[in-house]
Protein backbone atom coordinates (compact mmCIF):
# COMPACT_ATOMS: atom_id res chain seq x y z
CA UNK A 1 0.00 0.00 0.00
CA UNK A 2 1.28 3.71 -0.70
CA UNK A 3 0.80 6.07 1.39
CA UNK A 4 -0.88 8.79 -0.03
CA UNK A 5 0.11 12.45 0.92
CA UNK A 6 -2.67 14.91 1.44
CA UNK A 7 -2.57 18.71 -0.15
CA UNK A 8 -4.11 20.91 1.65
CA UNK A 9 -5.88 23.72 0.20
CA UNK A 10 -7.14 26.65 2.05
CA UNK A 11 -9.90 29.09 0.55
CA UNK A 12 -12.64 31.54 1.89
CA UNK A 13 -16.28 31.41 0.58
CA UNK A 14 -17.12 32.89 -3.33
CA UNK A 15 -13.20 31.68 -4.44
CA UNK A 16 -12.88 29.04 -7.06
CA UNK A 17 -10.59 26.04 -6.90
CA UNK A 18 -8.58 24.86 -9.94
CA UNK A 19 -6.51 21.86 -9.69
CA UNK A 20 -4.20 20.24 -12.27
CA UNK A 21 -4.26 16.54 -12.35
CA UNK A 22 -1.65 14.77 -14.55
CA UNK A 23 -1.29 11.18 -15.97
CA UNK A 24 0.50 9.15 -18.04
CA UNK A 25 -0.38 9.46 -21.32
CA UNK A 26 0.26 5.90 -22.63
CA UNK A 27 -1.77 4.64 -20.39
CA UNK A 28 -4.79 6.85 -19.62
CA UNK A 29 -5.21 9.57 -22.79
CA UNK A 30 -8.26 7.85 -23.54
CA UNK A 31 -10.15 7.13 -20.86
CA UNK A 32 -12.55 9.14 -18.60
CA UNK A 33 -11.64 11.10 -15.85
CA UNK A 34 -13.59 12.26 -12.74
CA UNK A 35 -13.45 14.12 -9.85
CA UNK A 36 -14.43 12.55 -6.92
CA UNK A 37 -15.48 13.74 -3.02
CA UNK A 38 -14.90 11.04 0.00
CA UNK A 39 -18.03 10.71 2.09
CA UNK A 40 -17.15 8.66 4.91
CA UNK A 41 -15.22 5.77 3.70
CA UNK A 42 -16.81 6.04 0.84
CA UNK A 43 -16.20 8.02 -2.63
CA UNK A 44 -18.78 10.10 -4.62
CA UNK A 45 -18.26 11.06 -8.35
CA UNK A 46 -19.42 14.37 -8.91
CA UNK A 47 -18.38 14.64 -12.34
CA UNK A 48 -16.48 12.99 -15.29
CA UNK A 49 -15.49 13.11 -18.39
CA UNK A 50 -17.16 12.16 -21.57
CA UNK A 51 -16.11 9.10 -23.89
CA UNK A 52 -12.85 10.11 -25.47
CA UNK A 53 -12.96 12.23 -28.47
CA UNK A 54 -11.26 14.29 -30.69
CA UNK A 55 -12.81 17.32 -29.78
CA UNK A 56 -13.17 16.88 -25.94
CA UNK A 57 -15.12 19.64 -24.30
CA UNK A 58 -15.09 21.37 -20.72
CA UNK A 59 -17.84 19.36 -18.80
CA UNK A 60 -19.90 20.55 -16.33
CA UNK A 61 -22.14 19.44 -13.62
CA UNK A 62 -23.26 22.38 -11.35
CA UNK A 63 -20.15 24.92 -10.04
CA UNK A 64 -17.71 21.89 -11.11
CA UNK A 65 -16.22 22.13 -14.55
CA UNK A 66 -13.70 19.13 -15.93
CA UNK A 67 -11.31 19.50 -18.95
CA UNK A 68 -9.10 17.22 -20.35
CA UNK A 69 -6.28 17.69 -22.21
CA UNK A 70 -5.13 13.95 -23.85
CA UNK A 71 -2.45 15.46 -25.54
CA UNK A 72 -0.54 16.91 -22.59
CA UNK A 73 -1.67 14.28 -20.35
CA UNK A 74 -3.82 16.83 -18.00
CA UNK A 75 -6.98 17.21 -16.57
CA UNK A 76 -8.16 20.37 -15.45
CA UNK A 77 -10.44 20.91 -12.66
CA UNK A 78 -12.89 24.08 -11.45
CA UNK A 79 -14.86 24.31 -8.66
CA UNK A 80 -16.32 28.21 -8.57
CA UNK A 81 -18.52 29.83 -5.83
CA UNK A 82 -16.62 27.77 -2.84
CA UNK A 83 -18.87 27.21 -0.04
CA UNK A 84 -18.16 26.43 3.73
CA UNK A 85 -20.07 22.97 3.44
CA UNK A 86 -17.47 22.16 -0.17
CA UNK A 87 -14.87 21.40 2.60
CA UNK A 88 -13.84 17.94 2.40
CA UNK A 89 -11.56 15.40 0.99
CA UNK A 90 -11.46 14.97 -3.12
CA UNK A 91 -10.15 13.35 -5.80
CA UNK A 92 -9.37 12.80 -9.20
CA UNK A 93 -9.43 9.39 -10.78
CA UNK A 94 -9.47 7.56 -14.14
CA UNK A 95 -12.95 6.43 -14.25
CA UNK A 96 -12.93 2.54 -15.35
CA UNK A 97 -16.23 1.72 -14.70
CA UNK A 98 -18.91 2.77 -11.43
CA UNK A 99 -17.59 0.28 -9.26
CA UNK A 100 -13.88 0.56 -10.08
CA UNK A 101 -11.39 3.96 -10.44
CA UNK A 102 -7.66 4.45 -10.79
CA UNK A 103 -6.70 7.69 -8.02
CA UNK A 104 -4.24 10.19 -9.96
CA UNK A 105 -2.15 10.97 -7.24
CA UNK A 106 -2.47 12.91 -3.79
CA UNK A 107 -6.01 13.53 -2.27
CA UNK A 108 -6.63 17.30 -2.07
CA UNK A 109 -8.08 18.44 1.44
CA UNK A 110 -10.19 21.26 0.63
CA UNK A 111 -11.28 23.85 3.44
CA UNK A 112 -13.35 26.40 2.64
CA UNK A 113 -13.83 29.39 5.31
CA UNK A 114 -16.33 32.20 5.77
CA UNK A 115 -15.06 35.32 5.48
CA UNK A 116 -13.53 38.07 2.87
CA UNK A 117 -13.11 36.37 -0.05
CA UNK A 118 -11.44 39.33 -2.07
CA UNK A 119 -7.89 38.24 -3.49
CA UNK A 120 -5.88 39.07 -0.07
CA UNK A 121 -3.14 41.80 -1.24
CA UNK A 122 -0.32 39.86 0.78
CA UNK A 123 3.24 39.85 -0.66
CA UNK A 124 4.38 36.85 0.98
CA UNK A 125 5.79 34.39 -1.67
CA UNK A 126 8.44 31.90 -0.72
CA UNK A 127 9.13 29.64 -3.66
CA UNK A 128 10.50 26.86 -1.62
CA UNK A 129 7.27 26.15 0.18
CA UNK A 130 4.79 24.33 -2.70
CA UNK A 131 2.49 23.37 0.07
CA UNK A 132 2.00 27.21 1.19
CA UNK A 133 -1.91 28.29 1.89
CA UNK A 134 -2.65 30.09 -1.37
CA UNK A 135 -2.60 33.79 0.44
CA UNK A 136 -1.15 35.58 -2.64
CA UNK A 137 -2.55 33.86 -5.20
CA UNK A 138 -6.53 32.74 -4.27
CA UNK A 139 -8.71 32.80 -7.55
CA UNK A 140 -11.18 35.23 -8.79
CA UNK A 141 -14.73 35.57 -6.89
CA UNK A 142 -17.59 33.60 -8.16
CA UNK A 143 -18.27 31.97 -11.36
CA UNK A 144 -15.61 32.18 -13.71
CA UNK A 145 -17.03 29.95 -16.38
CA UNK A 146 -18.12 32.13 -18.99
CA UNK A 147 -16.21 30.99 -22.07
CA UNK A 148 -18.32 30.75 -24.69
CA UNK A 149 -16.69 27.11 -25.76
CA UNK A 150 -19.41 24.57 -25.51
CA UNK A 151 -19.75 22.86 -22.28
CA UNK A 152 -21.17 19.75 -21.71
CA UNK A 153 -23.26 19.18 -18.49
CA UNK A 154 -23.46 16.28 -16.97
CA UNK A 155 -25.55 15.11 -14.12
CA UNK A 156 -23.96 13.70 -10.78
CA UNK A 157 -23.03 10.07 -10.22
CA UNK A 158 -23.58 7.73 -7.57
CA UNK A 159 -20.95 6.48 -5.42
CA UNK A 160 -18.01 4.04 -6.08
CA UNK A 161 -15.82 2.38 -4.66
CA UNK A 162 -12.08 2.94 -5.06
CA UNK A 163 -9.44 0.16 -5.85
CA UNK A 164 -6.52 1.39 -7.70
CA UNK A 165 -4.13 -1.38 -9.53
CA UNK A 166 -1.34 -0.41 -11.66
CA UNK A 167 1.55 1.78 -11.67
CA UNK A 168 -0.75 4.79 -10.07
CA UNK A 169 -1.37 4.86 -6.57
CA UNK A 170 -2.14 1.67 -4.52
CA UNK A 171 -5.09 1.45 -2.13
CA UNK A 172 -5.72 -1.70 0.04
CA UNK A 173 -8.49 0.03 1.81
CA UNK A 174 -10.53 3.15 1.46
CA UNK A 175 -10.07 4.25 4.51
CA UNK A 176 -6.13 4.51 4.20
CA UNK A 177 -7.49 8.01 2.60
CA UNK A 178 -8.88 9.18 5.40
CA UNK A 179 -5.60 8.59 7.90
CA UNK A 180 -2.77 10.33 5.72
CA UNK A 181 -0.56 13.49 7.19
CA UNK A 182 -0.94 16.33 6.20
CA UNK A 183 0.85 19.51 4.82
CA UNK A 184 0.39 22.82 6.44
CA UNK B 1 21.58 28.98 -4.67
CA UNK B 2 18.35 28.25 -6.88
CA UNK B 3 19.32 28.04 -10.56
CA UNK B 4 18.64 26.12 -13.46
CA UNK B 5 22.46 25.20 -15.50
CA UNK B 6 21.57 24.37 -18.84
CA UNK B 7 24.11 22.71 -21.01
CA UNK B 8 26.20 24.93 -24.46
CA UNK B 9 25.30 25.88 -27.71
CA UNK B 10 24.99 23.54 -30.53
CA UNK B 11 25.34 23.54 -33.82
CA UNK B 12 23.35 20.36 -36.09
CA UNK B 13 22.39 19.32 -39.49
CA UNK B 14 19.18 18.95 -40.76
CA UNK B 15 17.33 15.91 -39.53
CA UNK B 16 19.61 15.06 -36.69
CA UNK B 17 18.57 15.52 -32.97
CA UNK B 18 19.42 17.64 -30.49
CA UNK B 19 19.50 17.08 -26.49
CA UNK B 20 19.76 19.98 -23.80
CA UNK B 21 20.14 19.07 -20.15
CA UNK B 22 18.99 21.18 -17.28
CA UNK B 23 20.29 20.59 -13.64
CA UNK B 24 18.27 22.06 -11.03
CA UNK B 25 20.15 23.14 -7.67
CA UNK B 26 18.89 25.29 -4.38
CA UNK B 27 15.37 22.81 -4.40
CA UNK B 28 14.05 19.77 -4.29
CA UNK B 29 13.92 18.80 -7.99
CA UNK B 30 11.07 16.65 -7.49
CA UNK B 31 8.72 19.12 -5.90
CA UNK B 32 8.46 21.51 -8.77
CA UNK B 33 7.10 20.75 -12.76
CA UNK B 34 9.60 21.54 -15.43
CA UNK B 35 9.14 22.98 -18.95
CA UNK B 36 10.46 23.72 -22.29
CA UNK B 37 10.12 27.24 -23.83
CA UNK B 38 11.88 28.44 -26.81
CA UNK B 39 12.29 31.61 -28.39
CA UNK B 40 13.34 31.86 -32.07
CA UNK B 41 15.90 34.96 -33.68
CA UNK B 42 13.51 37.74 -33.06
CA UNK B 43 10.42 36.01 -32.32
CA UNK B 44 8.31 35.61 -29.19
CA UNK B 45 8.14 32.65 -26.48
CA UNK B 46 6.94 29.35 -27.56
CA UNK B 47 5.81 26.52 -24.93
CA UNK B 48 6.95 23.33 -26.15
CA UNK B 49 5.69 21.18 -22.78
CA UNK B 50 6.06 20.02 -19.52
CA UNK B 51 7.27 16.70 -17.40
CA UNK B 52 6.66 15.94 -13.53
CA UNK B 53 10.11 14.82 -12.12
CA UNK B 54 9.01 13.26 -9.67
CA UNK B 55 6.69 10.49 -11.83
CA UNK B 56 8.22 11.22 -15.44
CA UNK B 57 4.53 12.43 -16.29
CA UNK B 58 4.89 14.55 -19.66
CA UNK B 59 2.81 16.79 -21.84
CA UNK B 60 3.98 18.04 -25.41
CA UNK B 61 2.33 20.85 -27.34
CA UNK B 62 0.55 19.20 -30.50
CA UNK B 63 3.31 21.20 -32.95
CA UNK B 64 6.42 19.33 -31.49
CA UNK B 65 4.54 15.68 -30.70
CA UNK B 66 6.40 12.85 -32.32
CA UNK B 67 9.53 14.98 -32.28
CA UNK B 68 10.03 16.08 -28.19
CA UNK B 69 10.97 13.71 -25.88
CA UNK B 70 11.49 15.01 -22.35
CA UNK B 71 13.02 12.84 -19.82
CA UNK B 72 15.14 13.28 -16.52
CA UNK B 73 17.25 11.88 -13.90
CA UNK B 74 16.38 12.44 -10.47
CA UNK B 75 19.88 11.18 -9.06
CA UNK B 76 21.41 13.91 -10.41
CA UNK B 77 18.34 16.56 -10.61
CA UNK B 78 18.65 16.94 -14.23
CA UNK B 79 15.79 17.31 -16.82
CA UNK B 80 16.19 16.71 -20.49
CA UNK B 81 14.92 17.80 -23.74
CA UNK B 82 15.78 16.38 -27.22
CA UNK B 83 14.51 17.78 -30.38
CA UNK B 84 14.23 15.03 -33.49
CA UNK B 85 14.40 15.46 -37.39
CA UNK B 86 15.77 19.02 -36.84
CA UNK B 87 14.77 21.70 -39.35
CA UNK B 88 16.17 25.14 -39.99
CA UNK B 89 12.64 26.66 -38.40
CA UNK B 90 14.42 24.95 -35.33
CA UNK B 91 17.06 27.41 -34.51
CA UNK B 92 16.25 29.08 -31.54
CA UNK B 93 16.82 29.62 -27.56
CA UNK B 94 15.70 26.80 -25.67
CA UNK B 95 14.67 27.76 -22.09
CA UNK B 96 13.89 25.35 -19.16
CA UNK B 97 11.69 26.76 -16.69
CA UNK B 98 9.99 25.72 -13.20
CA UNK B 99 6.30 26.06 -12.93
CA UNK B 100 5.73 27.44 -9.31
CA UNK B 101 2.36 26.47 -7.90
CA UNK B 102 1.03 26.96 -4.39
CA UNK B 103 0.73 23.37 -3.81
CA UNK B 104 1.49 20.68 -6.54
CA UNK B 105 -1.60 19.72 -8.24
CA UNK B 106 -2.65 24.11 -8.27
CA UNK B 107 -3.67 24.51 -12.22
CA UNK B 108 -0.82 27.52 -11.95
CA UNK B 109 1.55 27.90 -14.61
CA UNK B 110 4.05 30.54 -13.28
CA UNK B 111 7.58 30.03 -14.39
CA UNK B 112 9.54 31.92 -11.54
CA UNK B 113 12.53 30.29 -12.63
CA UNK B 114 14.76 30.13 -15.82
CA UNK B 115 17.44 28.71 -16.86
CA UNK B 116 19.81 30.94 -19.52
CA UNK B 117 19.12 29.45 -22.29
CA UNK B 118 20.56 26.73 -24.74
CA UNK B 119 21.24 28.33 -28.44
CA UNK B 120 20.61 25.38 -31.12
CA UNK B 121 21.45 26.13 -34.46
CA UNK B 122 20.49 23.81 -37.14
CA UNK B 123 21.92 24.46 -40.43
CA UNK B 124 23.36 22.30 -43.25
CA UNK C 1 -5.64 27.52 -29.22
CA UNK C 2 -5.64 30.49 -27.17
CA UNK C 3 -4.14 32.96 -29.18
CA UNK C 4 -2.52 36.38 -27.60
CA UNK C 5 -3.00 39.61 -29.21
CA UNK C 6 -0.53 41.77 -27.51
CA UNK C 7 -0.14 45.48 -28.03
CA UNK C 8 1.57 47.65 -29.18
CA UNK C 9 4.33 45.62 -30.25
CA UNK C 10 7.20 48.45 -29.87
CA UNK C 11 7.00 51.81 -27.74
CA UNK C 12 9.42 54.63 -26.51
CA UNK C 13 8.62 56.74 -23.94
CA UNK C 14 10.70 58.94 -21.86
CA UNK C 15 11.93 58.31 -17.65
CA UNK C 16 8.98 58.84 -15.44
CA UNK C 17 6.65 58.06 -18.07
CA UNK C 18 3.94 56.21 -17.41
CA UNK C 19 3.41 53.08 -19.72
CA UNK C 20 0.73 50.52 -20.49
CA UNK C 21 0.61 46.83 -22.66
CA UNK C 22 -2.08 45.00 -23.18
CA UNK C 23 -3.08 41.94 -24.13
CA UNK C 24 -6.40 40.71 -25.51
CA UNK C 25 -7.06 36.80 -25.36
CA UNK C 26 -9.08 35.08 -28.48
CA UNK C 27 -10.85 33.73 -25.21
CA UNK C 28 -11.85 33.99 -21.62
CA UNK C 29 -8.90 33.13 -19.49
CA UNK C 30 -10.12 33.62 -16.41
CA UNK C 31 -7.59 35.73 -14.71
CA UNK C 32 -4.80 33.40 -14.99
CA UNK C 33 -2.40 35.30 -16.91
CA UNK C 34 1.49 36.30 -16.15
CA UNK C 35 3.05 38.81 -17.38
CA UNK C 36 7.38 38.61 -17.63
CA UNK C 37 10.61 40.83 -18.27
CA UNK C 38 12.81 39.77 -21.00
CA UNK C 39 16.14 41.73 -21.22
CA UNK C 40 18.61 40.94 -24.16
CA UNK C 41 20.48 38.11 -23.72
CA UNK C 42 18.67 37.34 -20.38
CA UNK C 43 16.24 34.51 -19.20
CA UNK C 44 12.43 36.12 -19.03
CA UNK C 45 11.82 37.16 -15.42
CA UNK C 46 8.31 36.79 -14.22
CA UNK C 47 6.68 40.53 -12.69
CA UNK C 48 3.25 39.68 -12.45
CA UNK C 49 1.17 36.42 -12.33
CA UNK C 50 -2.53 35.54 -11.83
CA UNK C 51 -3.37 38.92 -13.41
CA UNK C 52 -2.55 41.35 -10.78
CA UNK C 53 0.04 40.05 -8.26
CA UNK C 54 3.42 41.26 -7.80
CA UNK C 55 6.35 38.61 -7.63
CA UNK C 56 8.21 38.70 -4.32
CA UNK C 57 11.16 41.31 -5.13
CA UNK C 58 9.37 43.15 -8.35
CA UNK C 59 9.38 46.98 -7.78
CA UNK C 60 5.79 48.45 -6.91
CA UNK C 61 5.69 50.43 -10.22
CA UNK C 62 4.77 47.31 -12.16
CA UNK C 63 1.25 46.28 -12.23
CA UNK C 64 -1.59 44.26 -13.65
CA UNK C 65 -5.37 44.05 -14.24
CA UNK C 66 -7.81 43.22 -15.96
CA UNK C 67 -10.22 40.03 -16.55
CA UNK C 68 -12.34 37.82 -18.98
CA UNK C 69 -10.47 38.39 -22.54
CA UNK C 70 -9.03 41.79 -21.67
CA UNK C 71 -5.54 42.60 -19.90
CA UNK C 72 -2.94 45.18 -18.53
CA UNK C 73 0.45 45.98 -17.90
CA UNK C 74 1.42 49.03 -16.63
CA UNK C 75 4.58 50.36 -15.19
CA UNK C 76 3.37 53.57 -13.20
CA UNK C 77 6.93 55.89 -13.65
CA UNK C 78 9.34 54.33 -16.32
CA UNK C 79 12.79 53.89 -15.21
CA UNK C 80 16.19 53.26 -17.55
CA UNK C 81 16.60 49.39 -15.95
CA UNK C 82 12.74 48.89 -17.49
CA UNK C 83 14.15 49.13 -21.21
CA UNK C 84 13.03 45.28 -22.28
CA UNK C 85 10.60 43.06 -23.81
CA UNK C 86 7.49 42.42 -22.26
CA UNK C 87 5.46 39.25 -23.20
CA UNK C 88 2.36 38.14 -21.17
CA UNK C 89 1.58 34.78 -20.86
CA UNK C 90 -2.07 32.73 -20.54
CA UNK C 91 -2.73 29.46 -19.10
CA UNK C 92 -6.69 29.52 -18.33
CA UNK C 93 -5.99 26.70 -21.26
CA UNK C 94 -3.96 24.87 -23.56
CA UNK C 95 -1.61 25.03 -24.33
CA UNK C 96 -0.03 27.77 -23.09
CA UNK C 97 0.68 30.74 -24.99
CA UNK C 98 2.56 34.14 -25.27
CA UNK C 99 2.06 37.37 -26.34
CA UNK C 100 3.99 38.62 -29.52
CA UNK C 101 5.83 40.60 -26.95
CA UNK C 102 6.23 45.07 -26.81
CA UNK C 103 9.34 46.18 -26.84
CA UNK C 104 10.06 49.24 -24.43
CA UNK C 105 12.13 51.56 -24.89
CA UNK C 106 13.48 55.07 -23.78
CA UNK C 107 13.37 58.19 -25.29
Known amino acids: TTELTEEKYEYKEGQTLEVKCDYALEKYANSRKAWQKMEGKMPKILAKTERPSENSHPVQVGRITLEDYPDHGLLQVRMTNLQVEDSGLYQCVIYQHPKESHVLFNPICLVVTKGSSGTPGSSENSTQNVYRTPSTTAKALGPRYTSPRTVTQAPPESTVVVSTPGSEINLTNVTDIIRVPVFN | QVQLVQSGAEVKKPGASVKVSCKAS????????INWVRQATGQGLEWMGW????????GYVKKFQGRVTMTRDTSISTAYMELSSLRSEDTAVYYC?????????????????WGRGTLVTVSS | DTQMTQSPSSLSASEGDRVTITCQAS??????LNWYQEKPGKAPKLLIY???NLETGVPSRFSGSGSGTDYTFTISSLQPEDIATYYC?????????FGGGTKVEIK
Open chain 2, 97 to 113: ARRRAVYRSSWEWYFDL
Open chain 2, 26 to 33: GYTFTSYD
Open chain 3, 27 to 32: QDIFND
Open chain 3, 89 to 97: QQYGNLPLT
Open chain 3, 50 to 52: HAS
Open chain 2, 51 to 58: MNPNRGNT
